[in-house]
Interface confidence: low
């Protein structure tokens, strides 16, 4: 489901599929 994160933004159920670098372990950059 949807979750509210600590910054007050609503995160979709598939948010963790968004590969990015800064803190995403699923990303390929580090």
């Amino acid at each position: 489901g949807w979750t509210l994160n600590s910054a007050g933004y609503l995160l979709g159920p598939h948010a963790v599929g968004n590969h990015r670098s800064f803190s995403d372990k699923n990303g390929l950059t580090s």
């Epitope: 979750t3 994160n5 600590s6 910054a7 933004y9 995160l11 948010a15 963790v16 968004n18 590969h19 990015r20 670098s21 800064f22 803190s23 995403d24 372990k25 990303g27 390929l28 950059t29 580090s30």
Partner: antibody, heavy 113, light 112 residues
Framework: EVQLVQSGAEVKKPGATVKISCKVS????????MHWVQQAPGKGLEWMGR????????IYDPKFQGRVTITADTSTNTAYLDLSSLRSEDTAVYYC??????WGQGTLVTVSS | DVVMTQSPLSLPVTLGQPASISCRSS???????????LEWYQQRPGQSPMSLIY???NRFSGVPDRFSGSGSGTDFTLKITRVEAEDVGVYYC?????????FGGGTKVEIK
């Protein structure tokens, strides 16, 4: 609800070491990289390094290498930042962060004799 | 290290008007995997930073669509179509393609 709760403000003398904790709830830290970012008073953001809590692998900005150690305890879902040989220019707010917009509230470290 | 240079340093804007922030990298931040890990962060006064944009142009869930990111290679832009009072703060670009990861110096958005 996702929360990253950092330990309280610290006042340290030059040459000392400070250890800051970042207690996480709402997700397992081993599923994400955990990063630390420095912000000196009135200044911008500086990336310090990150850890993969699953295996303890770390990478650091060479600027901080040797004085910074990032660790994580998956049993308590907590990340830590150790900064040693403190000097006045280390006076700053330190943030822990993970992906998808989540940052801790920041910990002010003041280095003063 | 990759140096991220933002301009302007300060951006006074009128409510309801557009705003644009530039970020240039000292070298290409296209990663070897083909992606460009350029991100934008907002820091409201007295608050922790918040993520707005990842991979140049992708908005995080919940980020208003008045924010948009664009660019490629070494030249990137954050645009706010109509500035609202809650948009006041400092905006940082960030590259996560090359270690050490680096932030731009920040652009302070204020209301005229």
């Amino acid at each position: 609800e996702v929360q990253l709760v950092q330990s309280g403000a610290e006042v340290k003398k030059p040459g000392a070491t400070v250890k800051i904790s970042c207690k996480v709830s709402g997700f397992n830290i081993e599923d994400y990289y955990m990063h630390w970012v420095q912000q000196a008073p009135g200044k911008g953001l500086e990336w310090m390094g990150r850890i993969d809590p699953e295996n303890g692998n770390t990478i650091y900005d060479p600027k901080f290498q040797g004085r910074v150690t990032i660790t994580a305890d998956t049993s308590t879902n907590t990340a830590y930042l150790d900064l040693s040989s403190l000097r006045s220019e280390d006076t700053a707010v330190y943030y822990c962060a993970r992906g998808y917009v989540d940052w801790g509230q920041g910990t002010l470290v003041t280095v003063s004799s | 290290d990759v140096v991220m240079t933002q301009s302007p340093l300060s951006l006074p804007v009128t409510l309801g008007q557009p705003a644009s922030i530039s970020c240039r990298s000292s070298q290409s931040i296209v990663h070897s995997d083909g992606d460009t890990y350029l991100e934008w962060y907002q820091q409201r006064p007295g608050q922790s930073p918040m993520s707005l944009i990842y991979k140049v142009s992708n908005r995080f869930s919940g980020v208003p669509d008045r924010f948009s990111g664009s660019g490629s290679g070494t030249d990137f832009t954050l645009k706010i179509t109509r500035v609202e009072a809650e948009d006041v703060g400092v905006y940082y670009c960030f590259q996560g393609s090359h270690v050490p990861y680096t932030f731009g110096g920040g652009t302070k958005v204020e209301i005229k």
